[in-house]
Amino acid sequence: SGPVKELVGSVGGAVTFPLKSKVKQVDSIVWTFNTTPLVTIQPEGGTIIVTQNRNRERVDFPDGGYSLKLSKLKKNDSGIYYVGIYSSSLQQPSTQEYVLHVYEHLSKPKVTMGLQSNKNGTCVTNLTCCMEHGEEDVIYTWKALGQAANESHNGSILPISWRWGESDMTFICVARNPVSRNFSSPILARKLCEGAADDPDSSMV
């Protein structure tokens, strides 16, 4: 039994659970998902039993091996997978555990503006970046672009301080997860501060 293997997949995509077996005489191979049997293979008779009908179309064993390929991944396919190789030549089954994380492809992140103040010709506010559907494991980075700056800021909240009369700046939020990345519509400091000067309440940008 080897160490737990971590695998990553994307919604709608496919993932292969690699299985290299040195066992000579294999009686059966059982793949399990979160303690529920998924597939049983009996190599002798060439039998493959997929426990649940809904998985029949999604399960494959490429290249005639015993590595399990799972297609049309869904978010709830995330979890622990376990394979046991049973043989009369082994006292204990040979086992391998996998952890699968399935992530969604990220849509464009949304940006909201916090309360804003305009003091001494300086516009001060926060921009907050988030995913509409609350996707997990998202890392946010802000790009602040302008003649005087090209800076990155980590985190979902970007504090802004922009002085009227300065050259305009553009802010872009970049969202990333392990399988995709996307960016917000660009936000111009001048437009942001003009709009917020009229309406001090928090608003969508």
């Epitope: 990553v8 994307s10 993932v15 672009l145 553009t170 960016f183």
Partner: antibody, heavy 119, light 107 residues
Framework: EVQLVESGGGLVQPGGSLRLSCAAS????????MSWVRQAPGKGLEWIGE????????NYAPSLKDKFIISRDNAKNSLYLQMNSLRAEDTAVYYC????????????WGQGTLVTVSS | DIQMTQSPSSLSASVGDRVTITCKAS??????VAWYQQKPGKVPKLLIY???TRHTGVPDRFSGSGSGTDFTLTISSLQPEDVATYYC?????????FGQGTKLEIK
């Protein structure tokens, strides 16, 4: 020094296959999305596709999806392009490219490897 | 796919001239546009990204502007070493696409 070096190009017959490699050095290859871009002789640039750091997402140009396969081996700091059913119009210099700061624009390019499809 | 149409396809200008290359996207790409320079026999080199941000080490005679569908690369004072083909690229949506290129020569 950040570097990408392609290899595996050459002359191949129509209908044949070829596997290109790109060896990366000077940066943490396993953290970057990587792309392949090609350029036919005297023509413009064409994006082939990209692969994410752990190979769980591969995006292709739709017109090339069924004939090209992108893969990578982070342990070897290598990116690959498997090309099948090659035709004369696939004759091009093939570049691997790294996006700046993992964004979408390419700041590091390999020197390119020429693939010629001809009988 | 989003088409990126560059104009002109080639141009000849004198040293010191102001040179403008345009790129038109077939649909709105925001500011997700990059510009590259490719000298004869060399690999492409990133000049501009996010439509107007100069890449590290790029001389300030190069500037980019535009948003939505219309983008411009400007060389304020053409130098002999600027002889190259220039490409725009959109990265707003898949597949990433490049313009057909603008070949710049010195008169």
């Amino acid at each position: 020094e950040v570097q990408l070096v392609e290899s595996g190009g050459g002359l191949v017959q129509p209908g044949g296959s070829l596997r290109l490699s790109c060896a990366a050095s000077g940066f943490d290859f396993s953290r970057y999305w990587m792309s392949w871009v090609r350029q036919a002789p005297g023509k413009g640039l064409e994006w082939i596709g990209e692969i994410n750091p752990d190979s769980s997402t591969i995006n292709y140009a739709p017109s090339l999806k069924d004939k090209f396969i992108i893969s990578r081996d982070n342990a070897k700091n290598s990116l690959y392009l498997q090309m099948n059913s090659l035709r004369a119009e696939d004759t091009a210099v093939y570049y691997c490219a790294r996006p700046d700061g993992n964004y979408w624009y390419f700041d590091v390019w390999g020197q390119g490897t020429l693939v010629t499809v001809s009988s | 796919d989003i088409q990126m149409t560059q104009s002109p396809s080639s141009l000849s200008a004198s040293v010191g001239d102001r040179v403008t290359i345009t790129c038109k996207a077939s649909q709105d790409v925001g500011i997700a546009v990059a510009w590259y320079q490719q000298k004869p026999g060399k690999v492409p080199k990133l000049l501009i990204y996010w439509a107007s941000t100069r890449h590290t080490g790029v001389p300030d005679r190069f500037s980019g502007s535009g948003s939505g569908t219309d983008f411009t690369l400007t060389i304020s004072s053409l130098q002999p070493e600027d002889v190259a083909t220039y490409y725009c690229q959109q990265y707003s949506s898949y597949p990433y696409t490049f313009g057909q290129g603008t070949k710049l020569e010195i008169k």
